[in-house]
Amino acid sequence: SEVEVVPFQEVWGRSYCRALERLVDVVSEYPSEVEHMFSPSCVSLLRCTGCCGDENLHCVPVETANVTMQLLKIRSGDRPSYVELTFSQHVRCECRPLRE
Amino acid sequence: SEVEVVPFQEVWGRSYCRALERLVDVVSEYPSEVEHMFSPSCVSLLRCTGCCGDENLHCVPVETANVTMQLLKIRSGDRPSYVELTFSQHVRCECRPLRE
């Protein structure tokens, strides 16, 4: 049977260094808030990821932007309330030498 | 100032357990091929990720499908050649109890 094979150029294009949605734990971005719980406990952020086709290069952000999100903060013994938290997103990515 | 704040329901929807593109090292899926190099060295696969709104639940695949991709295999001292590699993708995800 003729299985649909993703051609090389498409595989390459989708694997190459770019900003991709990643789910990041809120407390990893706000370690000072570790004693509180947030809902959701993770947020979707754009992060540079992918391969560069050269072991001496890695995928890094060359432009970032802030995004502010509304989350529920769960304070012990109190009703949850909305808070605004600001996160850094990766806007533009490039393959740069590892030694930089 | 009326800064664009991502509202809670949208934050929740984007963070909740779902299949999301992730860049995965080829050799992590094909450890027996560790002595060879592939180009690209990583591939974009759908993987279940996200949070479940409950510490007793985690995001798991409940349906998977195979995808076959064309990559370049670099054999030492030989010209690279195309190979077809099959990977497992996550199609449908659900929040399930951790103990399962």
Epitope: S39, T68, L72, R79, S81, Y82, V83, E84, T86 | S1, E2, V3, V5, P7, F8, Q9, W12, Y16, C17, C52, G53, C95
Partner: antibody, heavy 116, light 112 residues
Framework: QIQLQQSGPELVKPGASVKISCKAS????????INWVKLKPGQGLEWIGW????????KYNEKFKGKATLTIDTSSSTAYMQLSSLTSEDTAVYFC?????????WGQGTTLTVSS | DIVLSQSPSSLAVSAGEKVTMRCKSS????????????LAWYQQKPGQSPKLLIY???TRESGVPDRFTGSGSGTDFTLTISSVQAEDLAVYYC????????FGSGTKLEIK
Amino acid sequence: QIQLQQSGPELVKPGASVKISCKASGYTFTDYYINWVKLKPGQGLEWIGWIYPGSGNTKYNEKFKGKATLTIDTSSSTAYMQLSSLTSEDTAVYFCVRDSPFFDYWGQGTTLTVSS
Amino acid sequence: DIVLSQSPSSLAVSAGEKVTMRCKSSQSLLNSGMRKSFLAWYQQKPGQSPKLLIYWASTRESGVPDRFTGSGSGTDFTLTISSVQAEDLAVYYCKQSYHLFTFGSGTKLEIK
């Protein structure tokens, strides 16, 4: 204890502007949203907008864009709402309210009367 | 915009009677992942500011008498007062916070 103390009643002429204040005490002002709500005589409650004192970010009900302007002074833990180009339709009681998504602490209300 | 329809607009009952009022939303207020509906009930007594009674559709606010019960999910919600007291004379509003905030038009409770 947590309190929201609003400024006193206002009698203003059509076309004028008014600024209502809401002084918060008993909690960390920058941690909670302040919302403003309108209660018109014989009618129900209407949400005007919110301000997040931690950032100064605001969000308005479309109906009140251009009518209401929300500001804060974090040094005095006070929220303000300015209403402009007043008409008789703006005659109402205005409440400041702490928190979202559920409104837990309300000010005592400020009565605004627009009359020539 | 989400529209909340409250019924009845007013009712009069004797002390000790059971009262039920309803709130219907034009769209679901349920966050299915959280398994919570973004609906609250408020009580406004004459000459006073509104007071939070119920949130998440069924969670009683601290200090609220247990004769007040909220129920429902999605689009249909109910506030029940199991045995009305004279001090329950008030207007009761439902409010959604799924998308921004809107209030129902209120149910005025009178005591015979």
